[in-house]
Interface confidence: low
């Protein structure tokens, strides 16, 4: 028979729990053996004090009885031949030599019937407290402070952990977080990052990625100071932060045992999310302007926002939805996070400026408004935070209320009358088509353009193919030639102030078709851009190249 207990001496800390195992081998008799635990105190090394027994409930010596009844001291059977002695809260007077004795069930006395191990009780000298997060500074106040950090900014917390145990021990320190307003139980404390007793740094499951990316850091500064830095704070980082220090000692058998643990609340941290702060307003109110006049709109980005820079960046843009059109509208212009401006599709050729005029005020200026610029304008601001490295992550966006912009129409009314000079044309001759344009309204300096179009019959009917441009004269007086069905020469010209002519030379049968004239009125703005102020379409003109009697 052999009774085995751990190799001693064991060092444990007052106020903590201890477990001492005992098992018996090589015995005869029933599989379920009984065990008795005794303590020999240093001041009375020959007196065995009965602690607890697996078979006798009255076994406990007076000093242990109340603790056994309260369940603070107990023997727990692991299996028939193994038990563990558990003491919930060690006291200084629990130091001494512990003997595990197994009453004999053997036919003859053989081997050892007890094992002894010394337990030494160390005073509780582990200290944990909040420390100012900077390298130096005054001690943090006793009540945990309430800290507010902006999303994307750095959260730094410090912890002081020290022990003056007279034995060689190692400290492991970890930073944990519990959800705001949630109860703090064992299950709710989530480890953020910890430094093991061998100085290896480990992060809790949700934080491992951020540790690997360098966004989460933990370092030891000096002998007893630990500093955690969470870069790029996120909404989910809000909560109550704790520092837990655990003291470890190496037992004689080579295994490591935790002998003390203390926790301190460091701070209640609120993360001011950008989405809860970002607000966008526009001015100066509903606008009514005339065509060609400048349109100026202001956008103000407000809220308790971090300044643009290392941790945060902003982009601001203007969107326009044409009057009566559904949907979010199209981009007019924007300034990116670097302050570089760009114009949206369809606005590239326009004189449009987007600029920052104050720390959080942005101006959109269209040098010459057009009726097509009428609609509702919104300012869109986006806030970004810098995560790991220099990568920006969009954290929030906000749109202003719609700002209505009205641009007066020019009130230009065009009418066009077209005809074929001479009424009848023959193959080989020149066909002259004339278009007279009448204009009512419009500003001074109105310019006219006119284009000629043809629809060709197929099998005696007009085809479903859209009309083709034959030629025209632009508002700048420049002629533009399209495609003539017969392939011969074409000329287009302005033959009077409101009169345009199309000539088809050397008519062929392919030139047969229905032609029309399409005039348009244009206005030039101060920024030299043009916009169309009106358009019309003449009635149809049929061109049928007859054959001369001699052609047969």
């Amino acid at each position: 028979r052999e009774v085995l207990v751990p190799e001693g001496p064991l060092y444990r800390v007052a106020g903590t729990a201890v477990s001492i195992s005992c098992n018996v081998t090589g015995y005869e008799g029933p599989a379920q053996q009984n065990f008795e635990w005794f303590l020999y105190r240093p001041e009375a090394p020959d007196t065995a004090l009965g602690i607890v027994s697996t078979k006798d409930t009255q076994f406990s010596y007076a000093v242990f009885k109340s603790r056994v009844v309260a369940g603070e001291v107990q023997v727990q059977r692991l299996q028939g031949d193994a038990v563990v002695l558990k003491i919930a809260r060690l006291q200084a007077q629990d130091a001494g030599i512990y003997e595990c004795h197994t009453p004999s069930t053997d036919t003859r006395y053989l081997g050892s019937y007890s094992g002894k191990v010394e337990l030494r009780v160390l005073p509780d000298v582990l200290q944990v407290s909040a420390a100012p997060p900077g390298p130096r500074g005054r001690q943090a106040p006793t009540s945990p402070p309430r800290m507010t950090v902006h999303e994307g900014q750095e959260l730094a917390l410090g912890c002081l952990a020290r022990t003056s145990t007279q034995k060689h021990t190692h400290l492991a320190v970890s930073f944990g977080r519990s959800v705001p307003e949630a109860p703090v139980g064992r299950s709710t404390l989530q480890e953020v990052v910890g430094i093991r007793s061998d100085l290896a740094v480990e992060a809790g499951a949700p934080y491992a990625e951020r540790l690997a990316a360098g966004e989460l850091r933990l370092g030891k500064e000096g002998t007893d100071r630990y500093r955690m830095v969470v870069g790029g704070a996120q909404a989910g980082d809000a909560g109550t932060y704790h520092c837990t220090a655990a003291e470890w000692i190496q037992d004689p058998d080579g295994s490591w045992a935790q002998i003390a643990e203390k926790r301190a609340v460091l701070a209640h941290v609120d993360v001011q999310t950008l989405s809860s702060q970002l607000a966008v307003t526009v001015g100066p109110g509903e606008r009514r302007i005339g065509p060609g006049e400048p349109l100026e709109l202001l956008c103000n980005v407000s809220g308790a926002l971090p300044p643009a820079g290392r941790h945060a960046a902003y982009s601001v843009g203007w969107e326009m939805a044409p009057a009566g059109a559904p949907g979010p509208g199209r981009l007019v212009a924007q300034l990116d996070t670097e302050g570089v401006g760009s114009l949206g599709p369809g606005y590239e050729g326009r004189h449009i400026a987007m600029e920052k005029v104050a720390s959080r005020t942005y101006r959109l200026r269209l040098e010459a408004a057009r009726p097509g610029d009428a609609g509702t304008y919104r300012c869109l601001a986006k806030a970004y935070v810098r995560g790991s490295g220099t990568r920006l992550r969009e954290a929030a966006s906000a749109r202003s209320r719609p700002l209505p912009v009205h641009v007066r129409e020019e009130g230009v009314v065009l009418e066009a009358v077209a005809w074929l000079a001479g009424g009848t044309v023959y193959r080989g001759e020149t066909a002259s088509l004339l278009c007279n344009i009448s204009v009512r309204g419009g500003p001074p300096g109105l310019r006219l353009a006119a284009s000629w179009w043809v629809e060709r019959p197929e099998d005696g009917e007009l085809s479903s193919v859209p009309a083709q441009l034959v030629g025209g004269v632009g508002q700048d007086g420049v002629a533009e030639l399209g495609v003539r069905p017969g392939g011969g020469p074409v000329s287009v010209e302005l033959v009077g102030p409101r009169s345009h002519r199309l000539r088809l030379h050397s008519l062929g049968p392919e030139d047969e078709g229905v032609y029309h004239c399409a005039p348009s009125a244009w206005v030039q703005h101060a920024d030299y851009s043009w916009y169309q102020a009106g358009s019309a379409r003449s009635g149809p003109v049929t061109v049928y190249p007859y054959m001369h009697a001699l052609d047969t």
Epitope: V179, P180, E181, A182, P183, V184, G185, R186, S187, T188, Q190, P206, A235, G236
Partner: antibody, heavy 123, light 108 residues
Amino acid sequence: AVTLDESGGGLQTPGGGLSLVCKASGFSISSYEMQWVRQAPGKGLEWVAGIDDDGSSRAYAPAVKGRATISRDNGQSTVRLQLNNLRAEDTGTYYCAKTIYAATLNAGEIDAWGHGTEVIVSS
Amino acid sequence: ALTQPSSVSANPGETVKITCSGGGSWYGSYYYGWYQQKSPGSAPVTLIYNNDKRPSDIPSRFSGSESGSTATLTITGVQAEDEAVYFCGGYDSTTTDMFGAGTTLTVL
């Protein structure tokens, strides 16, 4: 089988107090967070209070904060809700609920409910 | 606040989906439960907890899922006895809105 039996309901007077008790059986209560949920007549479920496995942390809904105390006796397998300064809007059926964790404060983790005890607050 | 539709209806044998959104994030994850109540004042029955866990005594036609912070309760092959009010439960850091307002399922 897991069973939760609530008691202590009945007719109460406004301004008075009541004590509801939930007796658990079929599982070891000491490993789980317990919650109280109530339902006013014709209304939906409303979370009232929660207490974690070892009773070290409690949380309350804003509607009862300052008037309610949740406690537990793991040895007796009971959870108690004390509600003072009763109001008419406290009327309803009170359910005791067991969660699957020790301390999560989450109404998405309830795996067992009691049958409820009816409370009527009226003068 | 947890948001769910006030009512849904289906013919027997059809598949019904009820959604719930607006729960708070618990360490970056979202956990919802689904509870059935056949009549007001009767005890709720847990159909699904932790997004997709189904108690052993609940029929397999009830299933749960969660994606992008929205939970979905799916009843495949709905039966007449499934007519009830379905509540979703979740996490809310303010403890104000831990349950949705309930969805009434009508089996036509």
